[in-house]
């Protein structure tokens, strides 16, 4: 039960006090007791419940006519059952007794009022009055947890605006309101109560720039909203009429959880006694609601696809046709960024990551815009953000970034359980160097901090700086599977490729050509690839790098070898010993449900079929997956990327609610 104030009674004159329903009010009957008195009794109106405890050990007894010793060990508490119809209509009488004196009486006139701040602390999507029974001042995780949730109002419901909704002090319309969380103030008081009392709604100064609160004012024609709390206003005096009254507030978060902001925001209502104009206002009662800002959540390849994004660039019509066909098969919407908007930047995966935010009453896709800021710089903010599609970015917007800050270097695993610890929303994966050095690359700290601060998809740092481009999507992918954990981890594997080529040579196919049919590209015989000592050494190094990640992923995602599929792939070391795919990197694939868009490897054709394609199909088709090999050689591969790098996908949010997990 909520804590009320302490009331001191004195025999000299009647005491007037306010008691808020649902609170426990302490009664100090000792400090002003007549000197010769040694005991007391209490009588109260029917609407007041008095508890007397004499401890230790506490013997509790409800009031009657019995007397109690007058000593500091006696605790007297009051609660009220009903709100008062008029000021001071509930009475408590304390009688003091002494051996030689007649009883001395002290009178207390109580006004019972109902004041409660309610939000959706049960996470049902509805605001139910709590009558302060539940402690709203704490926020707890898990299926039995409680606490309200706020969304960062980061979409743009007004198409004529260039800013996010949370960047203005206005409520555009009912669409805008739906992105906010409802909070209701319920009051029941005597009619004249607010002539001597005031309610103030407030937020801590440290949190005022993270939240905005609008008050709904019901006019004759429509309801209007005006801002009452926010970055410029930490408190607001409320004009509340006496009697029974409900006031609605709409709350929006302005910031995502981050290093300097754990994501919790407390809104408090304070009841102030303003009866004595010559004295400062005194706090009578406070009620608070704690909100947690919904985290930004990534979706893994195992979530159903809803929309595919790609770029139109010079001569990639065939690539786009293949992606269009794949999207149609997967029943996905397709969005193409035209040449004039992408400014010859085709790397859609690197520019953004599409996740979502969720409250019990609303789910919103949110695009995380990377700070790489190349030709596609404007695409997320101009073409993706919009009504019910939010936007967030982090990191320096001008310089100070590396290739590892592109979001081909940001992936998320499907849900996993690791040594008994559940990650029902999976774990974020990003690439890093294996140790810091003068020229090593890492994802910008601001991005790492943001990802960690979301709490629900605890990040795993992988080693990717060995690659020229340096992205995790160059050596790993996830595909859905009908068995085991519901997915397989795909890893690029030079060892598996050498094994395949060796088998082909053993069967007399050593003259078969890699890159056959590609104009202007020097073709390579299987036997030459197998006999090239330098290429072997390079791939031995690459294998060690991938194996390091393999063990890391097994440990951090709780995987067994049978959860991993090796995809045959060769690499070559380029300048500064950085690796690039030797032929189109098949693991860099587009996953749309059971439809896979895989870079066409142009492997040696044996018995009319590319042996690399055949091998990959034999590994993935038993899982119910359909492989489509897409020619990206001249438009993507030779520019250091593949199908996954050149596409992006919005996926269905998890059915699991993030607040039901325990981070």
């Amino acid at each position: 039960m909520a804590q009320g104030t302490l009331i001191r009674v004195t025999p000299e004159q009647p005491t007037h006090a306010v008691c808020v329903l649902g609170t426990l009010t302490q009664l100090d009957i000792c400090s002003s007791a007549p000197e010769d008195c040694t005991s007391f009794s209490i009588n109260a109106s029917p609407g007041v419940v008095v508890d007397i405890a004499h401890g230790p050990p506490a013997k509790k007894k409800s009031t009657g006519s019995s007397t109690w010793p007058l000593d500091p060990g006696v605790e007297v508490t009051l609660t009220m059952k009903v709100a008062s119809g008029s000021t001071g209509d509930q009475k408590v009488q304390i009688s003091y007794y002494g051996p030689k004196t007649p009883p001395v009486k002290a009178l207390l006139y109580l006004t019972g009022v109902e004041i409660s701040l309610c939000a959706d602390i049960t996470r049902t999507g509805k605001v139910k009055p709590t009558r302060a029974v539940k402690d709203q001042r704490t926020w707890t995780w898990g299926p039995c947890g409680q606490g309200a949730i706020l969304l960062v109002n980061c979409d743009r419901d007004n198409l004529e605006s260039s800013a996010m909704d949370c960047e203005d002090d206005e409520v555009l319309d009912s669409e805008d309101l739906q992105d906010m969380s409802l909070m209701t103030l319920s009051t029941k008081t005597p009619k004249d109560f607010f002539t001597n009392h005031t309610l103030v709604l407030h937020v801590a100064r440290s949190e005022m720039d993270k939240v905005r609160v609008f008050q709904a004012t019901r006019g004759k024609l429509s309801s209007k909203c005006s801002v009452v709390l926010g970055p410029k206003w930490p408190s607001h005096y409320l004009m509340v009429p006496g009697g029974k009254h409900n006031m609605d507030f709409y709350v929006e978060a302005l910031a995502f959880p981050d290093t300097d902001f754990p994501g919790l925001i407390t809104l408090t209502i304070s009841l102030l006694d303003t009866s004595n104009l010559e004295l400062p206002e005194a706090v009578v009662f406070q009620d608070s609601v704690v909100f947690r800002v919904a985290p930004w959540i990534m979706t893994p390849n195992t979530q159903p696809p809803q929309e595919v994004y790609a770029c139109s660039i010079f001569e990639n019509e065939d690539f786009l046709k293949s992606v269009t066909t794949l999207a149609m098969k997967a029943k996905c919407k397709l969005t193409i960024c035209p040449e004039e908007e992408n400014m010859d930047d085709q790397w859609m995966q690197d520019e953004m990551e599409i996740g979502y935010i969720q409250a019990p009453h609303k789910t919103l896709p949110v695009v995380f815009d990377s700070p790489r800021n190349r030709g596609l710089k404007e695409f997320p903010i101009k073409r993706v953000m919009g009504p019910d599609f939010g936007y967030v970015t982090r990191g320096p917007q001008t310089g100070g970034i590396s290739g590892l800050d592109s979001f081909g270097n940001l992936e998320v695993s499907p849900p996993v359980t690791v040594r008994g610890k559940e990650y029902p929303l999976g774990r974020i994966l990003f690439g890093d160097s294996c140790y810091p050095s003068n020229d090593s690359r890492q994802m910008h700290q601001a991005l790492q901090d943001f990802l960690s601060a979301q709490q629900v998809q605890a990040p795993v740092k992988l080693y990717s700086d060995w690659l020229s481009v340096g992205h995790v999507d160059e050596f790993l992918s996830f595909v859905p599977a009908p068995d085991r954990k519901g997915f397989r981890l795909l890893l690029a594997s030079p060892r598996s490729c050498y094994k395949l080529f060796q088998e082909q040579q053993n069967e007399g196919h050593g003259e078969a050509l890699l890159f056959e049919g590609i104009k202007k590209k020097k073709q390579q015989k299987i036997k030459n690839i197998l006999s090239n000592k330098t290429l072997r050494e390079h791939n031995s190094f690459v294998e060690r790098c991938i194996d390091w990640n393999r063990e890391l992923l097994k440990r951090e995602l709780g995987l067994a070898e049978s959860d991993i599929i090796d995809i045959p792939q060769l690499f070559k070391l380029k300048e500064f010993s950085k690796a690039e795919a030797f032929f189109p990197n098949m693991v860099n694939m587009l996953v749309l449900g059971k439809h896979l868009g895989i870079p066409k490897p142009f492997g040696p054709v044996i018995n009319g079929r590319c042996c690399l394609e055949e091998k990959v199909c034999s590994l993935l088709e038993p899982l119910g997956l359909q492989c489509t090999f897409i020619n990206d050689f001249f438009t993507y591969h030779i520019r250091h990327g593949e199908v996954h790098c050149g596409t992006n996908v919005r996926r269905k949010p998890f059915s699991f609610k993030w607040w039901n997990m325990v981070p």
Epitope: S402, G403, R441, V469, I529, L573, E575, I638, R639
Partner: antibody, heavy 128, light 111 residues
Framework: QVQLVESGGGLVKPGGSLRLSCAAS????????VSWIRQAPGKGLEWVSF????????YYADSVRGRFTISRDNAKNSVYLQMNSLRAEDTAVYYC?????????????????????WGRGTLVTVSS | QSALTQPRSVSGSPGQSVTISCTGT?????????VSWYQQHPGKAPKLIIY???ERPSGVPDRFSGSKSGNTASLTISGLQAEDEADYYC???????????FGGGTKLTVL
């Protein structure tokens, strides 16, 4: 064959900044590794910085690391060297140089370590 | 002081051969086959004449040849001609924190 032209040099006070540009013509610079090399008056060549063709990694000489930043804008067919906290010892002719990354051999690293195309250079003088 | 050591000057008569040495360490010249040589005439930009120890770019006469033994690389110019008079610089990839090193340069005089 690509041709390179440097610009942006000039006189600057110690502690000041300059931004050098290297503009390419005759070919697409995105197919090339690019390095900046400098030569102090009457002295030898000193390698300064490197950027990969894919714009994915960069390297610096110890003498400039933390003060200089190399970047590229493939859409503008240009590479830049942002020079901050300049010192008297940074006075030199700055050359932009490149090597083609379009190699067909099975393995052919090394093209980022030599420079087969050079610009004419731009003079940077740091003096109070 | 340069990281790779070259003689300050060499000279030879037309038609003769000269060799310019470039000494590094086991962390640069000795470790990598990424040694290159540049020719620079006064007031001009350098020009690549040898890369990957011994390879010649197209257009460079075969009078120029490169080799390497241990931590020392060498540039040999046979059949010296007057237009060969210039400064010559060697360069190597390095394991050090500065990944490309140059020699201090050698002035070749054709007598």
């Amino acid at each position: 064959q690509v041709q390179l032209v440097e610009s942006g040099g000039g006189l600057v006070k110690p502690g000041g900044s300059l931004r050098l540009s290297c503009a390419a013509s005759g070919s697409t610079l995105s197919d090339y590794f690019v390095s900046w090399i400098r030569q102090a008056p009457g002295k030898g060549l000193e390698w300064v910085s490197f950027i990969s063709s894919a714009n994915t990694f960069t390297y610096y000489a110890d003498s400039v690391r933390g003060r200089f930043t190399i970047s590229r804008d493939n859409a503008k067919n240009s590479v830049y060297l942002q020079m901050n906290s300049l010192r008297a010892e940074d006075t030199a002719v700055y050359y932009c140089s490149s090597a083609n990354d379009d190699v067909d051999d099975i393995v052919a690293p090394g093209r980022g370590y030599y420079m087969d195309v050079w610009g004419r250079g731009t003079l940077v003088t740091v003096s109070s | 002081q340069s990281a790779l050591t070259q003689p300050r000057s060499v000279s030879g008569s037309p038609g003769q051969s000269v060799t310019i040495s470039c000494t590094g360490t086991s962390g640069d010249v000795g470790r990598y086959n990424h040694v290159s040589w540049y020719q620079q005439h006064p007031g001009k930009a350098p020009k690549l004449i040898i890369y990957n120890v011994y390879e010649r770019p197209s257009g460079v006469p075969d009078r120029f040849s490169g080799s390497k033994s241990g931590n020392t690389a060498s540039l040999t110019i046979s059949g010296l001609q007057a237009e060969d008079e210039a400064d010559y610089y060697c360069s190597s990839h390095s394991r050090s924190s500065t990944p490309v090193l140059f020699g201090g340069g050698t002035k070749l005089t054709v007598l």
